[in-house]
Amino acid sequence: CDLPQTHSLGNRRALILLAQMGRISHFSCLKDRHDFGFPEEEFDGHQFQKTQAISVLHEMIQQTFNLFSTEDSSAAWEQSLLEKFSTELYQQLNDLEACVIQEVGVEETPLMNVDSILAVRKYFQRITLYLTEKKYSPCAWEVVRAEIMRSLSFSTNLQKRLRRKD
């Protein structure tokens, strides 16, 4: 399955919007910095086929979408930027979803992919717990915004590598 050219443009737009969403200086939140243990090994593109990479990317974007779709998120960010960001993620989900279905059809997830999906889920669990513990403070959201920019960059790079493989 070839992801449409608009998909990579959407990736870049999502990153730009997320950058624009920053409200406070990252430097004023240094005390709140946290290592969320992003599962980089799941995004290096070497250990599994394109089909499996796409379902891990889907999980990544789906969890990001869910994270920014909460009431707490709505209260934290400028509404029009948040809506545009969510729209970009939603479109990416549509593209990835179509690819997962087209590549393999609806079937059981390959065993080696299961742990990759769980690793992404656990990563977002750590982010969710961090926000809860910090009571969704502005600095906590700023730390999370910077973290998601990093993880989306990894996703974008993996998608570039997948296109080169084609």
Partner: antibody
């Protein structure tokens, strides 16, 4: 509010199949994995597997592999769990439970569907 | 598969007493993915505690959770009549996800 409504009780003969449905409402159906958990009479809870309603991919517990099939219908926001080659030990209440993260993990459950396997 | 063993199987106490329920894992579980559920007869399970020690929405402060690695505890500081039920620990740290066999908390 989030609601999961399951189909009614079923009585099946050994060797037959059963298909239980779980209709979701109150949230964006495609965004959360749906899980199936069963409970035999007087026994504990047992995780069977999960399905991503967005693209339909599934993850099954090895114990049920080859006998369980989870599917979804996005047009009706419904997930299905089909269990084949039924035996008496499959007599149980079958629950759907919505995934999520933090306080949302299995925070929402269906009311349960009793499946009785008897000759 | 991570086996969760709960003890005791049955706990007989009176209202007002303190209840301590244990959950022991066959191998290490990330505390973020250890949960507790309460179940009453004829009802679906209800989320009590998430990520070892966090109270779910609407759960009274008399419930608390602690632990790490392979040993986890659910404590009810002063039992109320409505607390008598079956309690399950649950992990989603690795596939397949598993539940303990349950601890039945009954009125003495």
């Amino acid at each position: 509010q989030v609601q999961l409504v399951q189909s009614g009780a079923e009585v099946k003969k050994p060797g037959a199949s059963v298909k239980v449905s779980c209709k979701a409402s109150g949230y964006t159906f495609r965004n959360y994995w749906m899980h199936w958990v069963r409970q035999a009479p007087g026994q504990g809870l047992e995780w069977m597997g999960e399905i991503n309603p967005s693209h339909g991919r599934t993850i099954y517990a090895q114990k049920f592999q080859g006998r369980v099939t989870m599917t979804r219908d996005t047009s009706t926001s419904t997930v299905y769990m089909e269990l084949s080659s039924l035996r008496s030990e499959d007599t149980a209440v079958y629950y759907c439970a919505r995934g999520g993260l933090g306080p949302a993990w299995f925070a929402y459950w269906g009311q349960g569907t009793l499946v009785t396997v008897s000759s | 598969e991570i086996v969760l063993t709960q003890s005791p199987a049955t706990l007989s106490l009176s209202p007002g007493e303190r209840a301590t329920l244990s959950c022991s894992a066959g191998s290490s579980v990330d505390s973020s993915e250890l949960y507790w559920y309460q179940q009453k007869p004829g009802q679906a399970p209800r989320l009590l505690i998430y990520s070892t020690s966090n109270l779910a929405s609407g759960i009274p402060a008399r419930f608390s959770g602690s632990g790490s690695g392979t040993d986890f505890t659910l404590t009810i500081s002063s039992l109320e009549p409505e607390d008598f039920a079956v309690y399950y620990c649950h992990q989603w740290s690795s596939y397949p996800f598993t539940f303990g066999q349950g601890t039945k908390l009954e009125i003495k």
